[in-house]
């Protein structure tokens, strides 16, 4: 941006500059160019010997300028276009300036002026151009500075040329006020900080509703001596609830939101949210819908799932297989898990209680992702009720639960009562008994045994009687033994696991029961 301090051409001849000597030399004249009146200061004393004609501008207030640019537009006639070459004719003139804190008015003193330069034309106006009114306009620019006083004068010294000054323009340069990356940079005077630092660093301020991103750099630009902005550093981003529209941050429209300072536009409120107001940073969930803490604000609000579908409990002796299907309503989420809880009731007393501690699940019964589980070690003559609860990421935000129940009665045998009848270094004789009332239901007994500490292999023997001798055992070795009745319905209750030890080779009559 150029800030003009003086513009002779624009003043249409109204400036009234001082000429010295008065009434000689420089003269204000009007001409017609391109059918328009133009004014110029002209001098053409080319045949009158040595000349020293001065033209001084009015006093020019410096404003904020430190260095000024002087642009001259002028024409110079060819000395050879005059008869006899006009021996004292010159083709240059001199440009001067003087600084002052006050306007000296008509008090003109040459000694106060400092020469800026000799101004020479690139093109002179030869006879044919003059006759054809082809004005050979020259443009020269000079820079002066640093200036320190309140104002200054320019002066033009004619030394015998035929010259016309058509334009004198004095200006200084500013980097214009600018919006860049949502930052406002103020109008800045173009000035070199030093010879080695030709750029002035200017901090910008974020526009309304814009902020410097967290951990980011504030906006900076560099103002060059030519009045141009260079090298932007850092940026501003529209704050939450606002989006970038051209060079400003505009509040999100109703029904839209933006949750953080970013370059992203406002997003439409997701499903199952209430319509947001202008400038929203989030959209509230509809009643009955929720957001899990880890859910992004752009995600639809969701709700807990409905109960699992079609829960079935298939009894297999002392085991039950529970099967169910996914809830009809997932609540709009994929993170569904299932929890199984167990309650047992004694038929005689009608007493009920939790049974998690006494049963065994095929996998941990909480946070199940599959839709089936097997429960074993069920006690005979017991009523079991299993509840399968469906949960998702927002279930914890409500008190109500979504579950389905299934009940099953266990009619299998009581576990056999096992004891060690006899033993040797290589064998163990085991006997067992069950209540007489249940014996008719037993088809066979299954004896499972293995060395204690050896989890990788076990042996199974089946028998119809109430005893079995386990042969080919290792001396002085403890074995884990369990007896289970096999009924038409499947496996009955198993006995507890007993530890029996074979005799050592030294022989010992002690028996472990």
């Amino acid at each position: 941006k150029e800030v003009v301090l003086l513009d002779f051409a624009a003043m249409k001849g109204e400036l009234g500059w001082l000429t010295h000597p008065y009434g000689k030399g420089w003269d204000l004249m009007q001409n017609i160019m391109d059918d328009m009146p133009i004014y110029m200061y002209s001098v053409c004393n080319v045949v009158s010997g040595d000349q020293d004609n001065w033209l001084r501008t009015n006093w020019v207030y410096r404003e904020e300028a430190e260095r000024i640019f002087i642009e001259l537009k002028f024409t110079v006639r060819d000395c050879n276009s005059f008869p006899g070459g006009a021996s004292s004719c010159k083709e240059t003139f001199n440009l001067y300036y003087a600084e002052s804190d006050v306007d000296y008015g008509t008090n003109f003193q040459k000694r106060q002026f400092t020469k800026i330069d000799t101004i020479a034309p690139d093109e002179i106006t030869v006879s044919s151009d003059f006759e054809a009114r082809n004005v050979k306009l020259n443009v020269e620019e000079r820079m002066v500075g640093p200036l320190t006083r309140k104002g200054f004068y320019l002066a033009f010294q004619d030394i015998g040329a035929c010259v016309a000054l058509l334009s004198v323009r004095v200006y200084y340069k500013k980097c214009p006020e600018m919006l860049q990356s949502l930052a406002r940079f103020p109008e800045t005077i173009a000035v070199a900080v030093s010879d080695t630092q030709p750029l002035a660093t200017v901090a910008g301020t974020c526009v309304d509703h814009a902020v410097v991103p967290y951990g980011g750099e504030g906006p900076l630009m560099h103002c060059t001596v030519d009045g141009e902005w260079l090298v932007p550093i850092g940026q501003c981003l529209c704050q939450e609830g606002y989006e970038k529209v051209e060079d400003a941050c505009r509040a999100c429209s109703p029904g839209f939101f933006k949750s953080e300072a970013s370059e992203s536009p406002c997003l439409e409120c997701p499903e199952h949210t209430l319509p947001s107001t202008e400038g929203a940073t989030s959209c509230q969930c509809e009643e009955g819908y929720f957001r899990a803490p880890e859910d992004p604000l752009s995600m639809s609000c969701t709700r807990p799932p409905s109960a699992p579908n079609y829960l079935t409990a298939i009894g297999m002796g002392a085991k039950v297989e529970l099967r169910w299907t996914a809830p009809k309503d997932t609540g709009g989420r994929q993170d569904i898990v299932y929890s199984v809880t167990c309650e047992q009731c004694w038929p005689e007393s009608g007493e009920c209680g939790p049974c998690e501690a006494s049963v065994r699940y095929s996998e941990p019964p909480h946070a199940l992702t599959r839709t089936s589980v097997t429960v074993s070690d069920l006690e005979p003559h017991m009523n079991y009720t299993f509840a399968v609860e469906a949960r998702n990421g927002v279930s914890g935000l409500v008190t109500s639960r979504s579950f389905r129940t299934a009940s099953v009665s266990i009619n299998q045998t009581e576990p056999p009562k096992v004891r060690l009848e006899d033993r040797s270094t290589t064998s163990l004789s085991v006997t067992w008994s069950i209540p007489v009332s249940q014996q008719s239901r037993v088809w066979k007994y299954e004896v499972t045994y293995r060395k204690k500490g050896d989890a990788n292999s076990y042996n199974v023997r089946r028998t119809e009687g109430f005893s079995v001798t386990l042969d080919d055992l290792a001396p002085d070795t403890t074995y884990l033994v369990q007896v289970q009745a096999l009924t038409q319905e499947g496996q009955g209750a198993g006995s507890k696991v007993h530890e029996f030890q074979t005799l050592s080779t030294e022989g010992s009559a002690n028996m472990a029961v």
């Epitope: 003269d27 004249m29 009007q30 001409n31 017609i32 009146p37 110029m40 002209s42 001098v43 053409c44 004393n45 080319v46 045949v47 024409t75 110079v76 006639r77 276009s81 005059f82 008869p83 106006t125 006879s127 044919s128 003059f130 006759e131 054809a132 009114r133 004005v135 035929c162 010259v163 016309a164």
Partner: antibody, heavy 128, light 107 residues
Framework: EVQLLESGGGLVQPGGSLRLSCAAS????????MAWVRQAPGKGLEWVSR????????HYADSVKGRFTISRDNSKNTLYLQMNSLRAEDTAVYYC?????????????????????WGQGTLVTVSS | DIQMTQSPSSLSASVGDRVTITCRAS??????LAWYQQKPGKAPKLLIY???NLHTGVPSRFSGSGSGTEFTLTISGLQPDDFATYYC?????????FGQGTKVEIK
């Protein structure tokens, strides 16, 4: 010394034609803008027409436009004025005048010209 | 066209007098004005151009001034050779109009 000598004047009937000539000497004719200026008996001066140093551009006063034609022959150092459809009000002494920019000590040429050198004139009478 | 009006139309003066002739333009012509002298039966002679510039060979008792619409020709000490008719001419436009003339006679 600059000399301009007009010829070709005389008595002519209204509607008639006449051709005036101006012979130049003592200067570089091809450097000069040339013009015709007339003066009716007992009246003031009236500019008629001008022609540039190399034959253009040409300008005419409104009173003669379309009837008079100015021309020059730089090889013969001669200026001409062809006058057609003459009227009684064209009766005047016709002067040949010249302008040399070299003697115009100004930095920028004026919008038009003045006349530095004049011939002695030739009388044109239009009468029936 | 630009009209040029001279005043007075005629004047009587004595040798040695200071004589001033005025020329008024109907619109501004800056300083694009010339002055001529014409004696009876003779061609006009250029005295002044660009309002104040003396033509080569013209005596320095002749001077011109003015700009815009008001101009003057001054003869600072009238000589016997100066009795003649004086014309102003504008050359600010292609019409190049003359004033009607001012006759300077011997008193």
């Amino acid at each position: 010394e600059v000399q301009l000598l007009e010829s070709g004047g005389g008595l002519v009937q209204p509607g008639g034609s006449l051709r005036l000539s101006c012979a130049a000497s003592g200067f570089t004719f091809s450097h000069y803008m040339m013009a015709w200026v007339r003066q009716a008996p007992g009246k003031g001066l009236e500019w008629v027409s001008r022609i540039g140093p190399s034959g253009g551009p040409t300008h005419y006063a409104d009173s003669v436009k379309g009837r008079f034609t100015i021309s020059r022959d730089n090889s013969k150092n001669t200026l001409y004025l062809q006058m057609n459809s003459l009227r009684a009000e064209d009766t005047a002494v016709y002067y040949c005048a010249g302008y040399d920019s070299g003697y115009d000590y100004v930095a920028v040429a004026g919008p038009a010209e003045y006349f530095q050198h004049w011939g002695q004139g030739t009388l044109v009478t239009v009468s029936s | 066209d630009i009209q040029m009006t001279q005043s007075p139309s005629s004047l009587s003066a004595s040798v040695g007098d200071r004589v001033t002739i005025t020329c008024r333009a109907s619109q501004s012509i800056s300083t694009w004005l010339a002055w001529y002298q014409q004696k009876p039966g003779k061609a006009p002679k250029l005295l002044i151009y660009k309002a104040s510039n003396l033509h080569t060979g013209v005596p320095s008792r002749f001077s011109g001034s003015g700009s815009g619409t008001e101009f003057t020709l001054t003869i600072s000490g009238l000589q016997p050779d100066d009795f003649a008719t004086y014309y102003c001419q504008q050359y600010n436009s292609y019409s190049r109009t003359f004033g009607q003339g001012t006759k300077v006679e011997i008193k």
